[in-house]
Amino acid sequence: VPRWRQQWSGPGTTKRFPETVLARCVKYTEIHPEMRHVDCQSVWDAFKGAFISKHPCNITEEDYQPLMKLGTQTVPCNKILLWSRIKDLAHQFTQVQRDMFTLEDTLLGYLADDLTWCGEFNTSKINYQSCPDWRKDCSNNPVSVFWKTVSRRFAEAACDVVHVMLNGSRSKIFDKNSTFGSVEVHNLQPEKVQTLEAWVIHGGREDSRDLCQDPTIKELESIISKRNIQFSCKNIYRPDKFLQCVKNPEDSSCTSEI
C-alpha cells in the first residue's frame, strides 16, 4: 500500500539535488582558492541536516546554523551588491566586476541558487514530488528560511557603500515584500554602512524618465534614512551599455550617462 504523502502547492525538490549541491561545492572550492580546504561532504551533511526528517513548514533559522558555520566566508564588506527582481544582470555585473559580490557569488548562495528542496517529517526521504509554496502553504519552508538566513547574514556583513540593483520595469521598483525589502534593508548595520546606493535598471530603450523619483524609491529612501544610513540613487538607462562600460571603461562612449 503506497504511503500517504503530503501534497504541497510548489514544485518538488530539484532532481539530483544531493549530487548537484555536492558538485557545486566541489566546483566552487576549486575556483576560489580561499575556500579550497572546505570539506564538501561535511557541507552537504549540514545542509541535509537542516531539513531532512523535519516538517517542511516548521523550519527555523536555527536548523541552518550548522551549515552557516561551515559556510563561513569573508567577502570584502565594502564590495557587496544586493539585488531585487533583477538577478541575471546583477550576476553578469559581478562576473565582469570581479571584486564585487552578490550573495550567489558566495559559497552558500552558489550552492542553493535556483534550487528547490524539502523533506518529510519523520522520514529520511527527500520530497521530489512537491514542496511548500511560500504564499499558498507556509513561509517557514526550507527554501524560504534558507534564503532569509543567508540574506540576513550577508546584509549584516556589509559596510561602507552598499549597492543594490533594482528592476525599473516592475510596477514596484522597490518591493517591501521582496527579500531585499523585508530582510536585507532591515539588517544593514548603520554603524558600519554609510550609504545605500540604488541602481535603477531601465527596461525600455526610449525610457528617459528619472525612476529615482518613483514613489517606491522614495519609500526606500525613507526607510533607509530612518535607519541613519545615507541614500543615493542612479538611473541606469542602458543596461547593455552599462555592462559594456564596466568591461571597457576606457571606451570613449562611456563618459556620457548610461
Epitope: 570539506d39 558555520k69 563561513t72
Partner: antibody
C-alpha cells in the same frame, strides 16, 4: 619526482632577521601553495605561512607582524624572512608543498635555526 | 595552546590497534579537510592520511582516518615497533585563514 631543497643561516643573534630559501626541483611550481612550518625543540609543529606562484600569501596571525614570504617564479623558489628573532624562534624550519589534496605532501629536509646571544 | 587538540601520548603493544583523536571546532575540522602526519626524530614529517580518510600511495592500509563533526581520528592496526613516532593532525582554520596543527601525540609501542 618533486623535491624541496632548503638553505639559510643556522645561527642568529636576538633581533636579527631569519632568512631561509626553498627551491622546488622536478615539478610544477604554479598551481600549488608553498608553506613554511617550524618545530621548536620539544614542541609540536607550527605553521608559519604560505604563498602561491602569483604571490598571494596567508600568515599565522601570531607571527604575521614579523613574517614575510616571497616568491621567485623564475627560479622556482620561495623564501621566508622572520624579523626581530628571539630565543623562542629557535626551531627546525621546514618548507612544504600543499598538494592538490589539502595536505602537505612534500617536505624539505629541514633547517635547524638557533637564536642565541 | 593549539586550537586543535590531541592527546599528548598513547601506547599499545605490538600487533594491537591504537586510535589518536584530534578535536577542533566548526571553523577548522568541522568545515575543512583533515590530514595526518608521522614525524620521526631527525626526519621531515611524512603524510599518512589526506582528505580525512585517504592514504597516499605507499602508505599501508594499517593506517586509516575518519572524521565526524568537529573531531577526527587516526587509526593504526597491527602495531609495529617502527610506528613509534609523533603523530600530528592538521587542518585549515577558516577564521584564522591559516593552517593549524594539533599539538602532536607520541605513540609508544610497548
Amino acid at each position: 619526482q618533486v623535491q624541496l631543497q632548503q638553505w639559510g643561516a643556522g645561527l642568529l643573534k636576538p633581533s636579527e632577521t631569519l632568512s631561509l630559501t626553498c627551491a622546488v626541483y622536478g615539478g610544477s611550481f604554479s598551481g600549488y601553495y608553498w608553506s613554511w612550518i617550524r618545530q621548536p625543540p620539544g614542541k609540536g609543529l607550527e605553521w608559519i605561512g604560505e604563498i602561491n606562484h602569483s604571490g598571494s600569501t596567508n600568515y599565522n596571525p601570531s607571527l604575521k607582524s614579523r613574517v614575510t614570504i616571497s616568491v621567485d617564479t623564475s627560479k622556482n623558489q620561495f623564501s621566508l624572512k622572520l624579523s626581530s628573532v628571539t630565543a623562542a624562534d629557535t626551531a627546525v624550519y621546514y618548507c612544504a608543498r600543499e598538494g592538490l589534496r589539502h595536505s602537505f605532501d612534500i617536505w624539505g629536509q629541514g633547517t635547524m635555526v638557533t637564536v642565541s646571544s | 595552546q593549539s586550537v586543535v587538540t590531541q592527546p599528548p601520548s598513547v601506547s599499545a603493544a605490538p600487533g594491537q590497534k591504537v586510535t589518536i583523536s584530534c578535536s577542533g571546532s566548526n571553523s577548522n575540522i568541522g568545515s575543512n579537510y583533515v590530514s595526518w602526519y608521522q614525524h620521526l626524530p631527525g626526519t621531515a614529517p611524512k603524510l599518512l592520511i589526506y582528505d580525512n580518510n585517504n592514504r597516499p600511495s605507499g602508505i599501508p592500509d594499517r593506517f586509516s582516518g575518519s572524521k565526524s563533526g568537529t573531531s577526527a581520528t587516526l587509526g593504526i592496526t597491527g602495531l609495529q615497533t617502527g610506528d613509534e613516532a609523533n603523530y600530528y593532525c592538521a587542518t585549515w582554520d577558516t577564521s584564522l585563514s591559516g593552517w593549524v596543527f594539533g599539538g602532536g601525540t607520541k605513540l609508544t609501542v610497548l
